[in-house]
């Protein structure tokens, strides 16, 4: 396994609709044909997998149908979007990139993006 640098923003604020987007960029000394991207969430010293996708270079990322993640790739950048977030989902979201093919295998783990989610205030009842 060879180490690889992965960069991601330090902080992102989710939208009022519970959507957060960030870019995960990896620096490899060459072009892989098969890349796996995994989003991990670290909260209270526990790490859980949020979503994962394997893609062929030049093709779109394909997450599972029930995944809360979507994404696109461009060169060595992956644009990730996480949907359906609520205040309780606030935490550190870590981007893990694996170059699966060709060998050798490269692994890179970002420092994480702190995603802050604020639940919207419920709309007050209106007399109109």
């Amino acid at each position: 396994c060879k180490a690889m640098h992965v960069a991601q923003p330090a902080v992102v604020l989710a939208s009022s609709r519970g959507i957060a987007s960030f870019v995960c960029e990896y620096a490899s000394p060459g072009k892989a044909t098969e890349v796996r991207v995994t989003v991990l969430r670290q909260a209270d010293s526990q790490v859980t997998e949020v979503c994962a996708a394997t893609y062929m270079m030049g093709n779109e990322l394909t997450f599972l149908d029930d995944s809360i993640c979507t994404g696109t790739s461009s060169g060595n950048q992956v644009n990730l979007t996480i949907q359906g977030l609520r205040a309780m989902d606030t935490g550190l979201y870590i981007c893990k990139v694996e170059l699966m093919y060709p060998p050798p295998y490269y692994l890179g783990i970002g420092n994480g993006t702190q995603i802050y989610v604020i639940d919207p205030e419920p709309c007050p009842d209106s007399d109109f």
Partner: antibody
């Protein structure tokens, strides 16, 4: 440590074939990476000639048309360059190199072998 | 083919100075650019990959920058051992292509 070493004749006659060997130590050429031939002309211009990948696939520079062939002997951990119908324009220093992926940075280079095409 | 142009064939600098070597790609190559140093009588040595990432063991006075079509290798606090020729290379697409080289001369 990974080492690449080129070998072959330093003088080739025009219209003949140029054949070079790259011997690799410290890493199996079937385990990974892409294994290239690059040449440097007088004046220092560099040209990528082609590669053979860890799984035996090849890719060549279109500028060399059908003159080039890269093969390997996995039992000896060597790969080879054959360039047919050479002219004086093929006089150069020839390097074998290694890079990651399909398109990448050459992280290891041989010391190079000078080839002169002359009658 | 993608053409990599290093417009300055020679650059002269002094020990302790800062010098920037430039490279222009004929089309967008993202950050798929490498830089090499070649000292007289030696093979090229990889310095930078992915436009801005140093290889292990490369002194931090070497810095790569740029994306798209314009790239720069900056050497700060130039040392006498930096006397060499510097080449850029694109690896966005085949055939892989190199710049023509920039020779650094130390005054």
């Amino acid at each position: 440590d990974v080492q690449l070493q080129e070998s072959g004749p330093g003088l080739v006659k025009p219209s003949q074939s140029l054949s070079l060997t790259c011997s690799v130590t410290g890493y199996s050429i079937t385990s990974g990476y892409v294994w290239n031939w690059i040449r440097q002309f007088p004046g220092n211009k560099l040209e990528w000639m082609g590669y053979i990948s860890h799984d035996g696939n090849t890719n060549y520079n279109p500028s060399l048309k059908n003159r080039i062939s890269i093969t390997r002997d996995t039992s000896k951990n060597q790969f080879f360059l054959k360039l047919n119908s050479v002219t004086t324009e093929d006089s150069a220093t020839y390097y074998c190199t290694r890079n990651y992926g399909y398109g990448g940075t050459m992280d290891y280079w041989g010391q190079g072998t000078a080839v002169s095409v002359s009658s | 083919d993608i053409v990599m142009t290093q417009s300055q064939k020679f650059m002269s600098t002094s020990v302790g100075d800062r010098v920037s070597v430039t490279c222009k790609a004929s089309q967008n190559v993202g950050t798929y650019v490498a830089w090499y140093e070649q000292k007289l009588g030696q093979s090229p040595k990889a310095l930078i990959f992915s436009a801005s990432y140093r290889y292990t063991g490369v002194p931090d006075r070497f810095t790569g920058s740029g994306s798209g079509t314009d790239f720069t290798l900056t050497i700060s606090n130039v040392q006498s051992e930096d006397l060499a020729e510097y080449f850029c290379q694109q690896y966005d697409s085949y055939p892989l292509t190199f710049g023509g080289g920039t020779k650094l001369e130390i005054k």
